[in-house]
């Protein structure tokens, strides 16, 4: 575009150099050339000469009119045809932009990943604006009334050191550009309620060589949170359907979960946890693949007849991915054997 151009005249845009996409736009060119009474004034857009909708207003001024201008950016300049000059003479140029006012930011979420030292807030920005849009995150203490403001694009990390004076905050996001300003809904945040436990990791799995073989999955976390509620989901690699188990965990020692699985099959396991009674889940852990051993004795295997852990508080449900193309969208099977619940908030689903 044109950042610094020596104009021999003026160029201006109505309604302005930044305008709403789809508007009708008039661009004016006024020459102030010495020793030139121009025969013609020409307009160029992105270096290409324009042919239509040009009006000569008077000796020095011309206008070009665009109906429903919808390009996000254009570089306009105008020239004069001076008698006795072989080349056209540059008069002036302008960068113009079209776009949209911002949508109100939605789905504002703030979490503290354990040990991170930051509160991370994310939101949906809505439809593209095509023009420079700034997001200001407001964090207001409900105890001291003091407000902090952070510039961001689609997320912000706020040091918990700057959140020492209070536990309760009001958080909202303001979207601002040349065409408008919108605020998100306000989010009430209690710092103690938004901590996500340190990542849970499946470290290994083994299948015993018993008459009825069982698979033991070992998993751990470095969390210091005492009361943690977890889900483990698993399926064969050839299956679309996940089984999900729930249990309370105490990470002062490595967790062991027992499964009775089909022999000679490749299984995928993933785990995620949350602080008991809180709403924010960890993302699913990295997929852990385990091959069960071959069947030793004769046994009629009925899928889903016995995949449970020897803990009375456990529930097992089945969820299925909609398709291999949409592995992150999960839905309940229409009929499940067990009391179930959807595996929501899946960030690392695999088909």
């Amino acid at each position: 575009g044109i950042t610094s151009i020596n104009c021999s005249g003026d160029m201006w845009v109505e309604p302005g150099e930044i305008f709403q996409m789809g508007m009708n736009v008039s661009i004016y060119c006024q020459e102030a050339l010495k020793h030139c009474r121009p025969r013609n004034l020409y307009f160029y857009k992105n270096g290409f000469k324009e042919e239509f909708d040009i009006t000569r207003i008077n000796r020095t001024t011309a206008r070009i009119w665009y109906k429903g201008f919808s390009e996000p950016h254009a570089y306009m300049h105008c020239t004069a045809e001076c008698p006795g000059h072989f080349q056209e003479t540059l008069i002036c140029g302008k960068d113009i932009s079209s776009g949209h006012p911002p949508d109100a930011p939605s789905n504002l979420t703030c979490v503290i990943y354990e040990y991170s030292g930051n509160m991370t807030c994310t939101w949906n920005t809505g439809k593209p604006t095509y023009i420079d849009t700034k997001y200001i995150v407001h964090v207001k203490s409900l105890e001291t009334e003091e407000e902090q403001q952070y510039l961001a694009s689609s997320y912000v990390k706020i040091s918990t050191d700057s959140l020492q004076g209070s536990r309760k905050y009001l958080v909202w996001v303001q979207a601002v550009n040349s065409l408008g300003m919108e605020n998100s809904q306000q989010l009430h945040v209690h710092l103690d309620d938004i901590v996500i436990p340190s990542a849970s990791i499946i470290s290994r799995a083994e299948t015993t060589n018993d008459t009825v073989p069982k698979t033991i999955v070992y998993w751990k976390s470095k969390t210091m949170i005492e009361k943690v509620f977890c889900e483990m989901r698993y399926k064969t690699t050839t299956n679309q359907t996940w089984s999900v188990k729930e249990f309370d965990a105490n990470f002062t020692y490595v967790q062991q979960s027992e499964f009775y699985l089909e022999p000679d099959s490749k299984y995928v396991f993933q785990v995620r946890c949350q602080e008991t009674g809180k709403r924010n889940w960890q993302p699913w852990s990295s997929p852990f693949v385990h091959q069960t051993s071959q069947e030793t004795g004769k046994r009629n295997w009925q899928p889903w007849s016995s995949p449970f852990v020897h803990q009375t508080s456990q529930t097992v449900s089945q969820v299925t991915a909609k398709s291999s193309h949409e592995p992150q969208k999960m839905e309940m099977l229409s009929a499940t054997i067990f009391r179930g619940h959807p595996a929501s908030g899946n960030h690392q689903d695999i088909g």
Partner: nanobody, 118 residues
Framework: QVQLQESGGGLVQPGGSLRLSCAAS????????MTWVRQAPGKGLDWVSG???????VYADSVKGRFTISKDNAKNTLYLQMNSLKTEDTAVYYC????????????RGQGTQVTVSS
């Protein structure tokens, strides 16, 4: 209560430099977003530069590359280093709490005059 006091203005030739200071008190300066705004003769208030609560800075196109905003939290002081000054930078400069958008400049100081002239 919030108090802001600007200083460092003066008369300078085009191409020269000035450093403005803003002494702050009555609030938690270290975690507050701050802005420099200016008012040219016969014109409205325009924002110049802002610094957010985490130290991210933003500048108006007209001063980008010439002005630098900074904070010294130990001294509760906001600065604006102005280089390559132009005649069009002539204005009264104010420091204010908050960023340049929204409920803007809810509190600002008395201002300091900057005149760029040959």
């Amino acid at each position: 209560q919030v108090q802001l006091q600007e200083s460092g203005g003066g008369l300078v030739q085009p191409g020269g430099s000035l450093r403005l200071s803003c002494a702050a008190s009555g609030f938690t300066f270290s975690t507050s977003a701050m802005t420099w705004v200016r008012q040219a003769p016969g014109k409205g208030l325009d924002w110049v530069s802002g610094i957010d609560s985490g130290g991210t800075t933003v500048y108006a196109d007209s001063v980008k590359g010439r002005f630098t905003i900074s904070k010294d939290n130990a001294k509760n002081t906001l600065y604006l280093q102005m280089n390559s000054l132009k005649t069009e930078d002539t204005a009264v400069y104010y420091c204010a709490t908050g960023l340049p958008w929204g409920n803007i400049w809810r509190t600002r100081g008395q201002g300091t005059q900057v005149t760029v002239s040959s």
